[in-house]
Interface confidence: low
């Protein structure tokens, strides 16, 4: 049935899907607070621009009876059930904000005739790449992959004089939603990462990972994993590690590394942490005071989704253009808008660009220090610390092939 959009005559509605199955186990109340805070800002910005319009959000809840795993495993059906709910109510907003699970977003995109934009806080998987009306406000797997390939190929920095072409990937199936899809992308045989590497093996058991740390016959010195320092410690403990081993710990949505009083534990000395550049400051707002760093990023993405809608609404209204058109649905890309915590840039496919930061542990200070940054928008690495106090020999990253250390 044809669903009418509540999106004209000075009244503009946002449909927010409040799904029990979510990329992060975040109380829906916090997401509501984030959306409402975003609405306040949008209303103010529109008012300041002389646009006397109404902007509201409708929260669409699933019944939670059937789809109650709480993670993304049963999200496909939950997403479609919510769309059915919208269809039955014959009422849809100008924009759909909500599905964060890759499964649900992919299926909803397939099963709907999307003449409206869909904004996601999540949908990290490669299957959600290049969707014409989908915008993703948390770094998708493709961005991580491009960084890794760029870094592997780099060989002209004082601290990295070898190109790498090999890697182990540790993936045991217990990962969080973001990590699951990041590692899934690295594992996929058809992905850019796999295509560019000569050797890549996925380690699925704790023992496999632990054995590699001191295995003289290992095929690569580099191991990629995803999670926080505690996750690594559970796996690695205080085991000895060969001096040429480099562990790349992907922990994008965690800004604890940048806090002044943080000291890196000893087990992190062989580790390079890949994270996102922290916001202008740690958030201190009504919706985020009690959130962990990851949840803060998730709630922030919801809030930024509202601000993005406000940004596009303002542009279209100022130009006298219709909101319920394919042009509007396809416009949420290739732009920069004023986000809650700084400017937010979306690439040509509506995916958020960011500055990734690679950290190392200084053997002198036991602090995390920035080794380099990477701008996903221009796919470029910027070295920061030209003389890092590494644990590795000669303060240089080793070759990725055992037995050919720094020369």
């Amino acid at each position: 049935s044809q669903v009418s959009q509540n999106c004209h005559n000075g009244s503009y509605e946002i449909s927010v899907l409040m799904m029990g199955n979510s990329a992060f186990a975040e109380p829906l109340k916090n997401l509501e607070d984030a959306v409402n805070e975003g609405l306040e800002i949008v209303r103010g910005r529109l008012q300041n621009a002389g646009l006397n319009v109404t902007v509201n959000a409708t929260f669409m809840y699933s019944d939670g009876l059937i789809h109650n795993s709480g993670d993304c495993r049963s999200s496909t059906c939950e997403g479609l059930d919510l769309l059915r709910k919208i269809s039955n109510a014959q009422r849809m907003g100008c924009v759909l904000i909500g599905p964060s699970c890759t499964y649900s977003t992919f299926q909803m995109y397939l099963d709907t005739e999307l003449s409206y934009p869909m904004i996601s806080a999540g949908s990290f998987g490669l299957s959600c790449d290049y969707k014409e009306t989908l915008t993703r406000l948390m770094s998708p797997a493709r961005k991580l992959m491009y960084f890794l390939v760029n870094f592997w190929k780099t060989n002209d920095l004082p601290f990295k004089t070898y190109s790498w072409s090999t890697s182990y990937v540790y993936k045991n199936g217990t990962e969080t939603e973001d990590c699951f899809w990041y590692l899934n992308a690295l594992e996929a045989s058809v992905s850019y990462f796999s295509h560019e590497l000569g050797f890549k093996v996925v380690l699925r058991q704790d023992k496999e990972f632990q054995d590699i740390l001191m295995d003289h016959n290992r095929k690569s010195n580099v191991i990629i994993m995803c999670g926080g320092p505690e996750f690594l410690y559970k796996l690695k403990g205080d085991r000895a590690v060969a001096e040429d081993i480099v562990i790349i710990l992907v922990d994008l949505f965690n800004d604890q590394y940048f806090e002044d009083n943080v000291t890196a534990p000893d087990y992190m000395k062989n580790v390079l942490v890949l994270t996102l550049s922290p916001g202008n400051s740690l958030l201190n707002s009504s919706f985020s005071r009690n959130l962990s760093p990851t949840k803060r990023d998730f709630a922030l993405a919801y809030l930024n989704g509202i601000l993005l809608f406000g940004h596009m609404l303002k542009i279209f209204l100022e130009n006298g253009e219709n909101i319920t058109t394919p042009k509007f649905a396809h416009a949420f890309r290739n732009l920069t808008f004023e986000g809650y915590d700084g400017p937010v840039t979306l690439d040509d496919w509506g995916d958020v660009d960011s500055t990734m930061v690679l950290l190392y542990t200084s053997v002198d200070t036991k602090k995390y220090k920035v080794l380099l940054t990477y701008d996903t928008h221009v796919n470029k690495t910027y070295p920061v610390d030209m003389s890092p106090t590494f644990t590795w020999k000669n303060s240089k990253l080793p070759n990725d092939i055992t037995g050919r250390g720094p020369q």
Partner: antibody
């Protein structure tokens, strides 16, 4: 029309704290970022720091240890405090609306603060 | 830290002439985050150009901006008497969050 007006003492003694207030009219202080920028006589511009909703701030690293920017939404004002001042902090101080995508579209007229005993 | 270097330090031209002011960054700057300002003696800076090439409200079309990466240019196609002032470029997005060039003084020849 958006207008910004700086106010505060024009003379501060060395080692004391410089305090300035910017009063905003024509725009709600809650809906934008707001920055402080200074300019020593005959020299270039230096960004000091910014504030946004709920008092969230970011500062120029070179001044971070001495700077506090705060906001009073009820008065539509934001303020600057710079502690332990020296003669090098003598400058014209401007408040400005910060559009985040990299530019300042409205500025106050500036206020000269001299640090001298 | 990104350092912006403007050249020339002083530019002497006559009304009616074309002025080309340069701003070079020590590392790449996103074109979304580069702006130009005009400042006259005793006045606050005035925004001319933002996002490298977008003119601010009320700025005449003789002012234009261009560039990408590390090299940016402000062009005044035909100088008017009121255009003689100091011009600053400014970037956002790298630590410190925001920085300005040292300025180019445009004076009457």
């Amino acid at each position: 029309q958006v207008q910004l007006q700086e106010s505060g003492p024009g003379l501060v003694k060395p080692s004391e704290t410089l305090s300035l207030t910017c009063t905003v009219s024509g725009a709600s202080i809650s809906h934008y970022y707001w920055s402080w920028i200074r300019q020593p006589a005959g020299k270039g511009l230096e960004w000091i720091g910014r504030i946004y909703i709920s008092g969230r701030t970011s500062y120029n690293p070179s001044l971070k240890s001495r700077v506090t920017v705060s906001v009073d939404t009820s008065k539509n004002q934001f303020s600057l405090k710079l502690s332990s001042v020296t003669a090098a902090d003598t400058a014209v101080y401007y408040c400005a609306r910060d559009r985040l995508t990299g530019y300042f579209d409205y500025w106050g007229q500036g206020t000269l603060v001299t640090v001298s005993s | 830290e990104i350092v912006l270097t403007q050249s020339p330090g002083t530019l002497s031209l006559s009304p009616g002439e074309r002025a080309t002011l340069s701003c070079r960054a020590s590392q790449s700057v996103s074109s979304s985050y580069l702006a130009w300002y005009q400042q006259k003696p005793g006045q606050a800076p005035r925004l001319l150009i933002y996002g490298t090439s977008s003119r601010a409200t009320g700025i005449p079309d003789r002012f234009s901006g261009s560039g990408s990466g590390t090299d940016f240019t402000l062009t005044i196609s035909r100088l008017e008497p009121e255009d003689f002032a100091v011009y600053y470029c400014q970037q956002y997005g790298s630590s410190p969050m925001c920085s300005f060039g040292q300025g180019t003084k445009l004076e009457i020849k």
